[in-house]
């Protein structure tokens, strides 16, 4: 496994990219003046206690910003949050940190990111533009859970 985070560019099937706005990740159409975030992706070192065949458990961070994606409950509902955390601090832990972990599954060119802490909940964007990234259980038309990854550098 890689010991350095892999920088990637992520967009959904509607060619919307991830942008950081007021400490929230939103998906917006790719335009000249849009500055997409670069996502850092690194595999978890400890998979013994994680489910097998569900995907590659990874941490997702915002490149150079010391922010990582995590899942936590707000009331009864799991929510997607950005937390100040160094992705390498997560990688170097002696235990998996499930709240920051996602099962990365690839089918052809499409990738999905399922929360390890909340199985069945996926990173998604609303089919409408300019919406925050969310966690959803509904894999239908209202939300897009399929993303395309482009390796950078």
């Amino acid at each position: 496994k890689s010991e350095m985070p892999q920088p990637v560019s992520i967009q959904d099937i509607n060619h919307r990219v991830w942008v950081l706005q007021d400490q929230i990740l939103i998906a917006v159409p790719r335009k000249d003046r849009v500055s997409p975030v670069t996502i850092s992706l690194i595999s978890c070192r400890h998979v013994e206690t994680l489910e097998k065949d569900r995907g590659n458990p990874i941490y997702l961070g915002l490149n150079g910003l010391n922010l990582c994606l995590m899942c936590a409950k707000a009331g009864d509902q799991p929510t997607l949050q950005l937390k100040e955390k160094d992705i390498m601090d997560l990688y170097n832990q002696p235990e998996p940190v499930k709240s920051f972990l996602f099962y990365h599954s690839q089918s052809g060119r499409n990738s999905t990111f399922e929360s390890v802490a909340f199985p069945g909940w996926f990173i998604a964007v609303s089919s409408e533009g300019g919406c925050p990234l969310i966690l959803t259980q509904e894999l239908g038309k209202a939300n897009t859970t399929d993303f395309g990854l482009t390796m950078l550098f």
């Epitope: 013994e48 206690t49 997560l90 002696p94 235990e95 940190v97 499930k98 709240s99 802490a117």
Partner: antibody, heavy 121, light 111 residues
């Protein structure tokens, strides 16, 4: 039945290095699933994790002790060792070695009997 | 001060039921990490009593049971016996501190 046995000096002078070895019998230290750890207990106090090692050499240390701790493994002797440098009276404790088994988080499922190390001049 | 908080002592008469609590935070028990329990009889090494919140290793009587909810866990002992007199420690992991953490220990006295 897996057994762990700590060995090493019972008395160490301040500023010197504490060295202990744990010998494992009844099982192989080279098992992929397990780490091997050191935990200490000052007299009359609670337990403190010092660090853990895998047979491959991967180590994890308690950040509060990291600058002074080295844990190593010798698979040929079925042993792992602890070195703690620049000791003070605060390092006086019973030192236990233990097997660290897969769980979430990992669990210390087999323990040695412990060895008391006193730091004194 | 321990990261996981336990009552310093509990007591009960033979045959009674006692519980020992273990309270953590959002970076350990509340982050989804399980809780393990150890029994330390006087003058001996700790022995694994409960792992993964509620599982007993073989040889541990079913008088001992564990549970977890939110940021805390508890150990229950029913049908208290004189030989249960010991120190009990909970253990988990804290991802903010990057350490395996133990409670401060609870001394159980059988009256």
């Amino acid at each position: 039945q897996l057994q762990l046995q700590e060995s090493g000096p019972g008395l160490v002078k301040p500023s010197e290095t504490l060295s202990l070895t744990c010998t494992v019998s009844g099982g192989s230290i080279g098992s992929r699933s397990y780490y091997w750890g050191w935990i200490r207990q000052p007299p009359g106090k609670g337990l403190e994790w010092i660090g853990s090692i895998h047979y491959s050499g991967t180590t994890y240390y308690n950040p509060s002790l990291k600058s002074r701790v080295t844990i190593s493994v010798d698979t040929s002797k079925n042993q792992f060792s602890l070195k703690l440098s620049s000791v003070t009276a605060a390092d006086t404790a019973v030192y236990y070695c233990a097997r660290v088994a897969p769980s979430y988080p990992r669990v210390f499922d087999y323990w040695g009997q412990g060895t008391l190390v006193t730091v004194s001049s | 001060q321990s990261v996981l908080t336990q009552p310093p002592s509990v007591s009960g008469a033979p045959g009674q039921r006692v519980t020992i609590s273990c309270t953590g935070s959002s970076s350990n028990i509340g982050a989804g990490y399980d809780v393990h329990w150890y029994q330390q009889l006087p003058g001996t090494a700790p022995k694994l009593l409960i792992y993964g919140n509620r599982n007993r290793p073989s040889g541990v009587p079913d008088r001992f049971s564990g549970s977890k909810s939110g940021t805390s866990a508890s150990l229950a002992i029913t049908g208290l016996q004189a030989e249960d007199e010991a120190d009990y420690y909970c253990q988990s992991y804290d991802y903010s501190l990057r350490v395996y953490v133990f409670g401060g220990g609870t001394k159980l006295t059988v009256l």
